[in-house]
Interface confidence: low
């Protein structure tokens, strides 16, 4: 899906209110420095490719964020905010439905939530130019 | 717990430059801004820049441009602040002040203790 | 470059006493902060966006207004609250305005 076209700030806006609360739930427990940020993104559409990977994407070791609050409010946002993202999104939400079984918060979800963090973050205020 | 840890006093003579370091601990030093910001005696509170630490992007207050320059070593969690061709009104507490963008608004939530700058003949 | 300017300079109180600190910019922003200063120490975040009060600072702060004219507002000053208070916009610049002092009646 090309996110170029979202409404950024509407979806900067849902972030700020409830999906970064969400993060922060999830994590809680967990230090701010315990897992080094290693994905990043430089521009909004190119941060929002890189959350909605690690947020839906299953991964070695976390197979399981698609069904937690954060996930699913991040769903509504891009369905919401960015033009023919729903219809992109039927098939693969299915054969999620059918492969996940229990939810396990594995030490690599863990990671992977502190990652999507920074890529929030990163989403939420665009780099400084370099001068 | 989120922590900046600037570097000691720094008596300067006019023309003179002087660099003041700002440890970082307590939080992912490139997930946030690092702003600069002085105050001379009994005078209100002024901003000199902004650097990313991510990229080292920087954005300066037009009034110190080209005199300031804003810089960080990543692996030291380290933000530095020099100031050039120095002169008696630059004398100030100089603060580092990490800006969380969480914050709806970009507040500096937590600011370094001080470094005092005397620039004197 | 945005201008702040704090009104009253000095605001002079007793504890236990209501404190209202205006901030006026020069042009529209989108949001305000406060930030209590006492002698020989940094300045420290009390609220941001407007309205929002920073961790661990008691519900007597609070903060209101939009677009040019924003309020901070101490319910019941305690002895503690004696201090400077700054505003801060957020733009390409940032700026701060002049402080209003809070001192002892």
């Known amino acids: 899906y090309d996110f170029t076209n979202c409404d950024f700030e509407k979806i900067k806006a849902a972030y700020l209110s409830t999906i970064s609360k969400d993060l922060i739930t999830y994590m809680s427990g967990t230090k701010s420095t315990e897992f080094n940020n290693t994905v990043s993104c430089s521009n909004r559409p190119h941060c929002l490719t890189e959350i909605q990977s690690l947020t839906f994407n299953p991964t070695a070791g976390c197979a399981s964020l698609a069904k937690e609050m954060f996930a699913m409010k991040t769903k509504a946002a891009l369905a919401i905010w960015c033009p023919g993202y729903s219809e992109t999104q039927i098939n693969a939400t299915q054969a999620m439905k059918k492969r996940r079984k229990r939810k396990v918060t594995t030490n690599k979800c863990l990671e992977q939530v502190s990652q999507l963090q920074g890529l929030w973050r990163r989403f939420n205020r665009p780099l400084l130019k370099q001068q | 717990e989120v922590q900046l840890v600037q570097s000691g006093a720094e008596v300067k003579k006019p023309g003179a430059s002087v660099k003041v370091s700002c440890k970082a601990s307590g939080y992912t030093f490139t997930d946030d801004y690092m702003n600069w910001v002085r105050q001379a005696p009994g005078q209100r509170l002024e901003w000199m820049g902004i650097?990313?630490?991510?990229?080292?992007?920087?954005s300066y207050n037009q009034k110190f441009k080209g005199r300031v320059t804003l810089t960080v070593d990543k692996s030291a969690s380290t933000a530095y602040m020099e100031l050039s061709s120095l002169r008696s009104e630059d004398t100030a507490v100089y603060y580092c002040?990490?800006?969380?963008?969480?914050?709806?608004?970009?507040?500096?939530?937590?600011w370094g203790q001080g470094t005092t700058v005397t620039v004197s003949s | 470059e945005i201008v702040l300017t704090q009104s009253p300079a000095t605001l002079s109180l007793s504890p236990g006493e209501r404190a209202t600190l205006s901030c006026r910019a020069s042009?529209?922003?989108?949001?305000m902060h406060w930030y209590q200063q006492k002698p020989g120490q940094a300045p420290r975040l009390l609220i941001y966006a407007t309205s929002n009060l920073a961790s661990g600072i008691p519900a007597r702060f609070s903060g209101s207004g939009s677009g040019t004219d924003f309020t901070l507002t101490i319910s019941r000053l305690e002895p503690e609250d004696f201090a400077v208070y700054y505003c801060q916009q957020w733009s390409s610049n940032r700026t701060f305005g002049g402080g209003t002092k809070v001192e002892i009646k």
């Open positions: 042009s529209s922003v989108s949001y």
């Open positions: 002040a990490r800006e969380d963008y969480d914050y709806d608004g970009y507040a500096m939530d937590h």
């Open positions: 650097i990313s630490p991510y990229n080292g992007g920087t």
